[in-house]
């Protein structure tokens, strides 16, 4: 299973949930789906409080049961540790896969905690973020704004992912914006 | 009682195909992960492929991924295992299990020209 | 593909105790609490002894016991008996290949 890894925004706007939590217990397989289940304790919800409505405690993220076909496996074994986790919610489940956005909290960037905590939000409904994996690459529409991490370095690492957020500057028109700015 | 039958099992040219089936009794069958399990002959136990209750979740192992499908039909309680471009290597006694907790007899997979 | 590593005879004499031991790693025996043991008589089925590391289905003897220790587990036959000469197998869940067997253990009941 490979996957390229989101910008921290597409993350946020692509999933139903996003919380801080912690890996408290020891996996578990059912053995009716065949689904990993990780006990967690959140710490904090950033987005998914209309999907959940009154079940806003998350107790359990599951993901499949092999590597091959995208199961997450969390090779953390320090159970104080915060992790951010974006998913999407399957009967009221968190589902995350190698695919998702799940990393520590401290090794994001200020301006990735501020993005999950309150900017990316602003970007979701008008604005995209669009991968540029070749050059040339060039802008589908006004909304989008080129993401160009992958070309110079991996893309979690990347000055756009770490810094900037697509946010509508005007009706029609997105641009990169630095979210150092806009930290408090 | 809990009873698992497997079918299916012969003789198939190299590059053939064959079907296997497995028939469920004695318990929920929707409930439960099922698996194969091969064994070829005076060797040990290879796990093969795993779907979930639903079907929704197929596992397979490296060696017969591409080739082999795994499907049920929880209407019929019934395991299914689809062999494509055999290998003599995959000659085996062929095994349906509950989550590896309940075993069947086994049906007997032969590849060879 | 390497399989978990099992010693590949071991014998007893009636009413000793004996013990097979499963070696794997910290992603299959040491990272979950999902093994099991398998008694195989020859042409016959695999039947389940212990799963979970150390749970016994209804219906096996409490002469059989299942414990684990880091990468280690380990099958132990009390007051050994002449209808336990059987090949055993331990079986674990691993998040690479999903579950993986030893290479089997064939038990000799001595005299």
């Known amino acids: 299973c490979t996957c390229v890894p989101p910008h921290p925004q597409t993350a946020f706007c692509n999933s139903d949930l996003v919380i801080r939590a912690k890996f408290v217990g020891t996996p578990e397989v059912n053995q009716t789906t065949l689904y990993q289940r990780y006990e967690i304790k959140m710490t904090k919800m950033y987005k998914g409080f209309q999907a959940l409505g009154d079940a806003a405690d998350i107790r359990f993220v599951y993901t499949p049961a092999m590597e091959s076909v995208c199961g997450y496996f969390h090779r953390s074994h320090n159970r104080s540790e915060e992790f951010l986790i974006a998913g999407k919610l399957q009967d009221g489940l968190l589902h995350i896969t190698t695919c998702s956005f799940v990393a520590p909290w401290n090794s994001l960037s200020l301006a990735q905690r501020r993005g999950f905590t309150k900017t990316y939000t602003v970007g979701c409904e008008e604005c995209t973020v669009f991968p540029c994996l070749s050059i040339p690459c060039k802008l589908q529409s006004g909304t989008h704004c080129l993401w160009t991490d992958q070309l110079l370095q991996g893309s979690e690492k990347g000055f756009q992912s770490r810094h900037l957020a697509c946010l509508p500057r005007e009706p029609g028109l997105c641009t990169w914006q630095s979210l150092r700015s806009q930290i408090a | 009682q809990v009873q698992l039958v497997e079918s299916g099992g012969g003789l198939v040219q190299p590059g053939g195909s064959l079907r296997l089936s497995c028939a469920a009794s004695g318990f929920t069958f929707s409930s439960y992960a099922m698996s194969w399990v091969r064994q070829a002959p005076g060797k040990g136990l290879e796990w093969v492929s795993a779907?979930?209750?639903?079907?929704?979740?197929?596992y397979y192992a490296d060696s017969v991924k591409g080739r082999f499908t795994i499907s049920r039909d929880n209407s019929k309680n019934t395991l299914y295992l689809q062999m494509n471009s055999l290998r003599a290597e995959d000659t085996a006694v062929y095994y349906c299990?509950?989550?590896?907790?309940?075993w069947g007899q086994g049906t007997l997979v032969t590849v060879s020209s | 593909d390497i399989a978990l590593t099992q010693p590949a005879s071991v014998s007893g004499s009636p009413g000793q105790s004996i013990t097979i031991s499963c070696t794997g790693t910290s992603s299959d025996v040491g990272g979950y609490n999902y093994v099991s043991w398998y008694q195989q008589h020859p042409g016959k089925a695999p039947k389940l002894m212990i799963y979970?590391?150390?749970n016994r289905p209804s219906g096996v003897s409490n002469r059989f016991s299942g414990s684990k220790s880091g990468n280690t587990a380990s099958l132990t036959i009390s007051g050994l008996q002449a209808e336990d000469e059987a090949d055993y197998y331990c079986q674990s869940y691993d998040f690479r290949r999903f579950s993986v067997f030893g290479g089997g253990t064939k038990l000799t009941v001595l005299g």
């Open positions: 299990a509950r989550f590896l907790d309940i």
């Open positions: 979970d590391v150390s």
């Open positions: 779907i979930s209750g639903s079907g929704g979740s197929t």
